[in-house]
Amino acid sequence: GTDSGSEVLPDSFPSAPAEPLPYFLQEPQDAYIVKNKPVELRCRAFPATQIYFKCNGEWVSQNDHVTQEGLDEATGLRVREVQIEVSRQQVEELFGLEDYWCQCVAWSSAGTTKSRRAYVRIAYLRKNFDQEPLGKEVPLDHEVLLQCRPPEGVPVAEVEWLKNEDVIDPTQDTNFLLTIDHNLIIRQARLSDTANYTCVAKNIVAKRRSTTATVIVYVNGGWSSWAEWSPCSNRCGRGWQKRTRTCTNPAPLNGGAFCEGQAFQKTACTTICPVDGAWTEWSKWSACSTECAHWRSRECMAPPPQNGGRDCSGTLLDSKNCTDGLCMQNKKTLSDPNSHLLEASGDAALY
């Protein structure tokens, strides 16, 4: 065939795209009624010709809806927004086990779309803790477990622990560990962990404090080393000696136990008695010497000093002038300037 050059027309022209099903830009969120304040539930959808709330399977009255409409800037599509209020009374009037719930239903020419269910609950926090922490006295460096079960609440209460009114942060002090069931663990109790601990439970309704648990970290006393033995009480013969120690290694702290046992020990001792030295009798005088003196001696041997006894006091040798024997006095004259030395030497001790 021949090509006429003319374009073949389609059997049908494409029509404008069909309007899609509604899409929720905002779905209703779970909410809690605090005291008597009603909650607002809100929906936004496009494209939407209508949006209505259904609560617990029943349509909410049209009069209870607040509706707004506008254009979405990005798409140019018609956006519809609707909100309702749910009061405490409405929630309380719902019988049965299921929670009060609401969802949105949006319409477009393509059909309907349902939002998620939003649950409305009455918030509360009971007054009494299911379990409160108990005070403890623990030795230094030991583990401590403080338990806390918060009061029942909706929403479930969050728990934090206070140490002397300061919030404990286990990421800052790794000696603390918090568990999912709200226990507080002190890994190794330090003296600085002696404190008042309080479990605090809080939700959107209230904040509750447990009774305060006092943790006392104590140190049991330990003995120092024994001191040296004292000298024997008697210088001579049987006596006593003692030694002491103190409960200071470490000293008891925060009610820790005092050291068990004796702070001092006593034992018998025997010291060998000292014997003081005494002189023997003087020996006989020696013959008169050429220097006109004669001598005598004695010894510290009657008895000798023993076991630390005192030495003899006095002289070993004694001398005095003499004129007999070998004395050469006739050679000396009265005018001899050294003649006085002989007389004076009578007291001299020669060694």
Epitope: E143, L178, T179, I185
Partner: antibody, heavy 115, light 106 residues
Framework: EVQLVESGGGLVQPGGSLRLSCAAS????????MHWVRQAPGKGLEWVAS????????SYADSVKGRFTISADTSKNTAYLQMNSLRAEDTAVYYC????????WGQGTLVTVSS | DIQMTQSPSSLSASVGDRVTITCRAS??????VAWYQQKPGKAPKLLIY???SLYSGVPSRFSGSRSGTDFTLTISSLQPEDFATYYC????????FGQGTKVEIK
Amino acid sequence: EVQLVESGGGLVQPGGSLRLSCAASGFNLYYYSMHWVRQAPGKGLEWVASIYSYSSYTSYADSVKGRFTISADTSKNTAYLQMNSLRAEDTAVYYCARSYAMDYWGQGTLVTVSS
Amino acid sequence: DIQMTQSPSSLSASVGDRVTITCRASQSVSSAVAWYQQKPGKAPKLLIYSASSLYSGVPSRFSGSRSGTDFTLTISSLQPEDFATYYCQQSYGPFTFGQGTKVEIK
């Protein structure tokens, strides 16, 4: 020196019972949490149960709840694991460990559940 | 229960290598994560507690860190005695361990 020594393991038939002991020395068990951890042959570690005597606190893994009981005799400084209604899947080396940090462990005792 | 997903399950490395093992918690566990080393036929040994605190007596080449629910054990320079299996463990909820990472000689 801190030491933990387990004992009481052995061969037992399914449905049978066994009591494991963990004798502690070098510290006062009353002031520490004690834990049992098991390890099946060629497998990883699995926590079984915990006790903290001072607070009378006990806790169990779901897999042993109702069958196993953890206890401690502080006068003997010993922790126990009473295992009843034993199953083949309880076959493992059982370790006891001290404190939440599990800083000290025993050498383990083998429990074999088999017919 | 809280799951601890540990990776890799095994790795080959040489002496002197820098080794990193990670654990991801299925939900927040605060910083309540410990790391243990276990050698065949032996009991586990504590290395790190509270995510990043080095246990006394453990060499400083071991370190731990946390980023949200991700926890990391790092061995800065692998030594011959470090070839073993490593486990993470969380103690925020009922204790759970990771599956373990076996560090083998390349």
